[in-house]
């Protein structure tokens, strides 16, 4: 019987034959920065090359006895999970190991930095196929470690890391908090977050996705044919590193941004019990469990988008929060969210030649989040059209007036503290869907994009009486690019995208007791690429 | 994920440039910052990663490291350059007393300094 974790990441219509490299030239290499390993274990023999790199601190304690099997335990197991011949994810993957953790599983930020530099130098000396770097380790937030990861990622390397086993916000740890790194939390056979003693998997906006990380059978360093069950976010990260290696062996040209979007797209959605996470982290934590794509064909013909949450702005009156997309992604829309409902909306603005999403806190607010919708849209030319607050009572509106440009997202930003408390919401005039509509005291920002064959449509779902949550989803074949509330009234906490669904959250009417405020409408902008869709049909 | 400039609670000491022997004052208006791990038991005081500005060449990194050693020696402190970084980030790893941080932050080309800290298998 196939172990549960390998079953879990294998989709029903999986085509194993497609994950062979198209030719021998594009061999993917997985670098493992961990403890020493037992390279003659049957699971990994001939698959793992032990480099001469070693940078580890002394073991703690005067009576510490080095026992080879203990020193090699963590690294051997992870190498087996990635590439083991029987219990591995990417059974043929070629690996290289660097020793940055000592026999007690402890290392240093500096040792890890030197290890990452070693990989970069190896890459420059002997350029090869795609590289995946697995970092099954975590320390406190480190600016320098995150910066090194960013540089390596920008050199075309895919970095995968453990979210951490501290039952805490992953953003407080490195390299988990580095935006360029794929950060992986751990789930169990029930698709639930892993508990490890009194702690467990980390969570929050710095986690990209979850993967199997409990009771994972893999190579044991006790003997060359031994197996052992281990648990942790390292094991989860090893699954994703294996999946990434398989995807890259089939499509060696995939960029980091494309790989991350595919990992998210093909994950199992909404299977994790969010009640395990602290309440303030639930909305920020992705409800995604990693899986292999069923097929490598046709994936390139989809419009892929993901949701990126900013750090919390903090509570000061003028506080703002900024969410950014990766360098290869387009910001197609921007929304904001505040648990107190006190916010002044959001806007898309240029920063360093790239659009970012900025949310604004309001007086008396506990702070806001900016939420960016980041998409892969080749040859896109996007711009933001802004309409200042309208004088007329009909509200502010803005549309995409350039030829060939389509509306991908709407944002609104206001200076008044209590927008819409007593004012009726504005309804969009019939027959004019390709425009953003907002409150007359708000400035409205439309994201307008031109890309080959891009088509978008607006989809709305309104509920007459206030509800805690109103949702609207895009149909099969369409991708959610924009999510907003029409128009923001004071009881709306904000809007955000979860997978292909636009969620508008309002104050809990059972606690406020107010039902007098008007309808809440969730507005989704759903897009697809016509020429990509046609190319996909031709393939099939 | 976390913004590059790290909104999180690492300690940041912004120490302004002062007149100091051989130290060239950093470019006008910029201040190098000091960062350390927010989790106290994981700190490794005595070892520091000195990160230099992005376009700094290897030769400048080596020169800056030697300058730090010379200035530290003048004050009676021993320092050891453990590694000079290039390829990913310009900078160097130095073993020194924390008393020298103020001095090191005023060296030319310095962007920030981070105290070394522990990482753990997960």
């Amino acid at each position: 019987s196939i172990p549960w974790n390998l079953e879990r990441i294998t989709p029903p219509r999986y085509r194993a034959d497609e994950y062979q490299p198209p030719d021998g030239s594009s061999q993917v290499e997985v670098y493992l920065l961990d403890t020493s390993i037992q390279s003659d274990h049957r699971e990994i023999e001939g698959r793992v090359m032990v480099t001469d790199f070693e940078n580890v601190p002394e073991e703690d304690g005067t009576r510490f006895h080095r026992q080879a099997s203990k020193c090699d335990s963590h690294g051997t197991h992870l190498a087996g999970v990635v590439s083991g011949r029987d219990a591995g994810v990417a059974k043929g993957a070629s690996m290289r190991s660097l020793r940055v953790l000592n026999c007690q599983g402890k290392g240093t930020v500096s040792g890890t930095l030197i290890g990452l530099e070693f990989i970069r130098k190896s890459q420059l000396i002997q350029p090869s196929g795609p590289l995946v770097v697995l970092l099954p380790l975590a320390g406190g937030y480190s600016r320098v470690l995150n910066a090194a990861c960013q540089r390596l990622a920008r050199a075309g390397v895919v970095l995968v890391t453990a979210a951490g086993n501290f039952r805490d916000d992953a953003c407080l740890y490195s390299p988990a908090s580095a935006p360029e790194v794929i950060t992986v939390g751990a789930t169990n056979a029930q698709d639930q977050p892993v508990t490890l003693g009194t702690l467990g998997t980390n969570f929050g906006r710095c986690v990209d996705l979850f993967a199997p990380g409990e009771d994972i059978i893999g190579a044991s360093s006790d003997c060359s044919t031994c197996f052992v069950s281990q648990s942790g976010t390292s094991q989860a990260a090893a699954h994703v590193a294996g999946i990434a290696a398989m995807m890259l062996s089939a499509e060696p040209e995939l960029t980091l941004a494309e790989l991350r979007q595919r990992l998210i797209h093909f994950s199992a959605k909404d299977v994790i019990n969010e009640a395990w996470f602290p309440e303030d982290q639930r909305v920020l934590t992705p409800n995604l469990v990693a899986a292999l794509p069923p097929s490598t064909h046709g994936a390139g013909w989809q419009l892929f988008c993901r949701t990126v949450w900013s750090a919390h702005s903090g509570p000061t009156r003028m506080a703002t929060a900024v969410a950014r997309c990766a360098p290869d992604e387009e910001l197609l829309s921007c929304s904001s969210f505040s648990r107190s409902g006190k916010r002044r909306g959001e806007r898309m603005e240029a920063q360093g030649g790239k659009l970012v999403c900025r949310a604004h806190n309001a007086f008396g607010g506990e702070g806001v989040y900016a939420i960016a919708r980041c998409c892969l849209l080749p040859q896109a030319n996007c711009s933001v059209h802004t309409a200042p607050p309208a004088e007329a009572s009909m509200g502010t509106r803005v549309h995409c007036h350039q030829q060939g440009h389509v509306l991908t997202g709407c944002s609104s930003h206001w200076e008044v503290e209590d927008l819409g408390t007593h004012k009726p919401p504005v309804l969009r005039p019939r027959g004019q869907p390709n425009q953003c509509v907002g409150h007359r005291e708000a400035s409205i920002h439309a994201s307008c994009c031109h890309a080959p064959g891009l088509e978008c449509k607006v989809k709305e779902h309104g509920i007459p009486a206030p509800q805690e949550q109103v949702t609207v989803a895009c149909e099969e074949g369409w991708t959610l690019t924009g999510c907003s509330a029409l128009p923001g009234t004071s009881h709306v906490l904000g809007a955000y995208a979860v997978d292909n669904t636009c969620v508008v959250r309002s104050r809990d009417v059972s606690t406020t007791g107010s039902t007098s405020e008007g309808a809440v409408t969730a507005v989704a902008i759903c897009c697809r690429s016509r020429h990509l869709a046609q190319a996909s049909q031709e393939l099939q | 994920q976390e913004d590059e400039d790290g909104d999180y609670e690492e300690l940041v000491l912004a120490l302004r440039s002062e007149e100091d022997g051989l130290a060239e004052a950093p470019e006008h208006g910029t201040t190098a910052t000091f960062h350390r791990c927010a989790k106290d038991p994981w700190r490794l005081p005595g070892t520091y990663v000195v990160v230099l500005k992005e376009e700094t060449h290897l030769s400048q990194s080596e020169r800056t490291a030697r300058r730090l050693q010379a200035q530290a020696a003048r004050r009676g402190y021993l320092t050891k350059i453990l590694h000079v970084f290039h390829g990913l980030l310009p900078g160097f790893l130095v073993k020194m007393s924390g008393d020298l941080l103020e001095l090191a932050l005023k060296l030319p080309h310095v962007d920030y300094i981070e105290e070394d800290s522990s990482v753990f298998a997960q």
Epitope: S1, I2, A189, D270, A275, W276 | -
Partner: antibody, heavy 121, light 109 residues
Framework: EVQLLESGGGLVQPGGSLRLSCKAS????????MHWVRQAPGKGLEWIGR????????KYNEKFKGKATISRDNSKNTLYLQMNSLRAEDTAVYYC??????????????WGQGTLVTVSS | DIQMTQSPSSLSASVGDRVTITCRAS??????LTWYQQKPGKAPKLLIY???SLQSGVPSRFSGSGSGTDFTLTISSLQPEDFATYYC???????????FGGGTKVEIK
């Protein structure tokens, strides 16, 4: 004390529909997934679906997709099961159950007393 | 999809007997198997979760073991109140759903 109280069962005509309710008390309703399970006379237990009251997310047994709709009202601590196009084979006792967390595992730890639905003309 | 097969489907035993019920999953479910007890006209009651952990308030004569695909529920010394039907249940990730075994009815000999 945790309690789940179902209601809404009874005799229904074939082709008809009904809505069952499950009133929860003694715990924070929105913090636990809730399930509906049914048991035909003399038969075993059959899972219908679940809801996360926190965000309204649902999952259904393939067999009940399009036939069953699970919803909740957090302000009333109440879970609902709407069943449409009922047939004789839908005759069963319908149970609601809470999905509790136990040291890294989940289980249906509290069950309602069940409500009998009889589909007959 | 995962199938859960319980055996035997029914058994007759006397008070004081040691009773063993097995449950086999068609796929690896790790240690995530739950056992329930149901008496006639009553709702099921949680006995054992995570294959071997006893729910509080359940007598220690009940025990569970196994992992992967083969699981066992054991009653070390059958008591009069233990005559009931026992169900195993696992999580089926492919359905994001829950699957019960067919049940084992324990009757008085």
């Amino acid at each position: 004390e945790v309690q789940l109280l179902e209601s809404g069962g009874g005799l229904v005509q074939p082709g008809g529909s009904l809505r069952l309710s499950c009133k929860a008390s003694g715990y924070t309703f929105s913090s636990y997934w809730m399930h509906w399970v049914r048991q035909a006379p003399g038969k075993g237990l059959e899972w219908i679906g679940r809801i996360d009251p926190y965000n309204g997310g649902t999952k259904y047994n393939e067999k009940f997709k399009g036939k069953a709709t699970i919803s909740r009202d957090n302000s009333k601590n109440t879970l609902y099961l709407q069943m449409n196009s009922l047939r004789a084979e839908d005759t069963a006792v319908y149970y609601c159950a809470r999905y509790g967390y136990y040291l890294g595992s989940y289980a249906m730890d509290y069950w309602g007393q069940g409500t009998l639905v009889t589909v007959s003309s | 999809d995962i199938q859960m097969t319980q055996s035997p489907s029914s058994l007759s035993a006397s008070v004081g007997d040691r009773v063993t019920i097995t449950c086999r999953a068609s796929q690896d479910v790790s240690r995530y198997l739950t056992w329930y007890q149901q008496k006639p006209g009553k709702a099921p009651k949680l006995l054992i979760y995570a294959a071997s952990s006893l729910q509080s308030g359940v007598p220690s004569r009940f025990s569970g073991s196994g992992s992967g695909t083969d699981f066992t529920l054991t009653i070390s010394s059958l008591q009069p109140e233990d005559f009931a039907t026992y169900y195993c249940q696992a999580y089926d990730y492919s359905l994001s759903g829950y699957v019960f075994g067919g049940g084992t009815k324990v009757e008085i000999k």
